[in-house]
Interface confidence: medium
């Protein structure tokens, strides 16, 4: 007869390690016990269990309810057992010892191997904005036994970087996300994707990416020119701008104080009925906590076009 | 018996390149780490790279970006590539088993970077 | 990088007697989880690859002398050959495995008086 067994034995931390050991003999034989023991370099081989035909199981007290028998149905020539809640050091050699009748005794040794799954970990990187060069996004670690893999998914166009070193019983990668930063950007996902053989499926944390920008300011409603004449209601200027984080707007004018009457309402100047007194040079300052910006335009109200004596004036005093 | 028998050594100019093999046999070889370590003539030992049993790759600065090491588990086989080879990666290579320690190492394979 | 420093470089020691040999890691090799200490003695003997002789600091490699005993913990470890033979004539490494990139002590040679 022989010993079937396995080299290496894999269970996750947490779960049930199956220690195999079964006896394939001759019908006449039996198998009369199974001894199980720890061989720990530093103690000498240790007992973990005592598999009796006849008396059944018998654990040492180091592994009191750790150490089962697999549940039924049970084959009299199966000495396997359940070592319960596997953790690290669990991790070494273990070995069955059979004892039958008429062939004998055999042994095997075999390797317990504890798999650790990893908790990744995501760190954004600084700020992001735009007109930086390469800058890191965010880094990804992950840390087991054996090594995890560490990648990024992501529609935005980057590079990845990975570094991991080994310590001890366990492995650490850090995997970063290197990109030019643009507006475009902004509100994009970036995924950390941990594969890792512990791992049912794969484990994804996603960073919100945030790119810091101001675009430029320009100023709309002085696109038709004659519709800024005197008694014109609602005219209004619009400054036009974007930026993350969102903008903050403040009206000026060059050449005094705003007009009374002038109205300022977040990025809009509200006028009252238009007189020759609203003419000037309007500015509109946009600033966010990265940069500012301004736009400027020049107003000049018309004349009443059903007035000819103040058309007459304009246009002389022109 | 547990055994690893390196080869793929020998003379080569400076900027060359070479690929080192490393044999295994007497054991799973795929539950195990692997490493590479070197010697220079009449020098300490000097740790050159490992790889964990899921394709993990470990190297020093020295090395880093010209050594590539990388594992065939189905033909039991652990190989190192070097590029950009210098005058100061001439030695011994051994490759190695780790478990708690390197429990196991081979004869090692002579590389002599030399014009 | 933890450098692994030893002493002395070179040790003659008469037959019979105790070697002792010493090696400093600049930072500690404890792994609080298993409160064990990755880290390795080797002895390597001319023309041959070196051997594995301890690990964890104090166990000793299955098929080595019990004349060889290993002790320490953290920073500070210690090498000792308590009854020196013909044989044991080699130079000895300490290694530490706690953390990449795994590093050598320069090695001690030892020799007989």
């Known amino acids: 007869g022989e010993l079937e067994t396995s080299d290496l034995v894999t269970v996750v931390l947490g779960q049930d390690a199956k220690l195999p050991c079964f006896y394939r003999g001759d019908p006449d034989e039996q198998v009369g016990q199974v001894a199980w023991a720890r061989v720990d370099p530093n103690e000498g081989t240790r007992e973990l269990a005592l598999l009796h035909s006849k008396y059944g199981l018998h654990v040492s007290p180091a592994y009191e309810d750790r150490v089962e028998q697999p549940p039924p149905p049970r084959d009299p020539l199966d000495g396997s057992i359940l070592l319960r809640n596997a953790v690290q050091a669990d991790e070494g050699e273990y070995e069955c010892r059979v004892s039958t009748f008429p062939a004998g005794s055999f042994q095997a040794r075999m390797r317990l191997r504890v798999l650790v799954p990893p908790l990744p970990s995501l760190n954004p990187g600084p700020p992001l904005e735009e007109g930086q060069g390469l800058t890191l996004a965010a880094s990804c670690t992950a840390e087991g036994s054996p090594a995890p893999s560490v990648t990024w998914d992501t529609e935005v166009k980057g590079t990845q970087s990975s570094r991991s070193f080994k310590h001890s019983r366990s492995a650490a990668v850090t995997s970063e996300f290197h990109l030019v930063p643009s507006r475009s950007m902004n509100g994009q996902p970036l995924t950390c994707v941990v594969s890792h053989p512990g791992l049912l499926q794969d484990q994804r944390i996603t960073h919100t990416l945030q790119v810091a920008f101001l675009a430029e300011a320009s100023v709309r409603g002085l696109e038709d020119q004659n519709l800024w004449h005197v008694g014109r209601e609602g005219a209004t200027l619009k400054c036009l701008s974007e930026g993350q984080p969102p903008p903050k707007y403040n009206w000026t004018r060059l050449d005094g104080p705003l007009p009374s009457g002038v109205r300022v309402k977040g990025d809009t100047l509200g006028f009252p009925p238009l007189t020759t007194e609203h003419s000037g040079v309007y500015v509109c300052h946009v600033s966010n906590e990265l940069s500012s910006r301004a736009s400027q335009v020049t107003v000049e109200v018309l004349a009443d076009p059903e007035d000819p004596g103040k058309q007459v004036d304009l246009v002389s005093a022109s | 018996e547990v055994q690893l028998v390196e080869s793929g050594g020998g003379l080569v100019q400076p900027g060359g390149s070479l690929r080192l093999s490393c044999a295994a046999s007497?054991?799973?070889?795929?539950?195990?780490?692997m490493h590479w370590v070197r010697q220079a003539t009449g020098k300490g030992l000097e740790w050159v790279s490992a790889?964990?049993?899921?394709?993990?790759?470990y190297y020093p600065g020295s090395v880093k970006g010209r050594f590539t090491i990388s594992r065939e588990n189905a033909k039991n086989s652990l190989y190192l590539q070097m590029n950009s080879l210098r005058a100061g990666d001439t030695a011994v290579y051994y490759c190695?088993?780790?478990?708690?320690?390197?429990?196991?190492w081979g004869q090692g394979t002579t590389v002599t970077v030399s014009s | 990088d933890i450098v692994m420093t030893q002493s002395p470089d070179s040790l003659a020691v008469s037959l019979g007697e105790r070697a002792t040999i010493n090696c400093k890691s600049s930072q500690s090799v404890l792994y609080n989880s298993n409160n064990k200490n990755y880290l390795a003695w080797y002895q390597q003997k001319p023309g041959q690859p070196p051997k594995l002789l301890i690990y964890?600091?104090?166990t000793r490699e299955s098929g080595v002398p019990d004349r060889f005993s290993g002790s320490g913990s953290g920073t500070d470890f210690t090498l000792t050959i308590s009854s020196l033979q013909a044989e044991d004539v080699a130079v000895y490494y300490c290694?530490?495995?706690?953390?990449?990139?795994?590093?050598f002590g320069q090695g001690t040679k030892v020799e007989i008086k």
């Open positions: 290694q530490q495995f706690y953390t990449t990139p795994y590093s």
């Open positions: 190695a088993r780790e478990w708690n320690g390197m429990d196991v």
């Open positions: 964890w600091a104090s």
């Open positions: 007497g054991f799973t070889f795929s539950s195990y780490d």
């Open positions: 790889i964990g049993t899921v394709g993990d790759t």
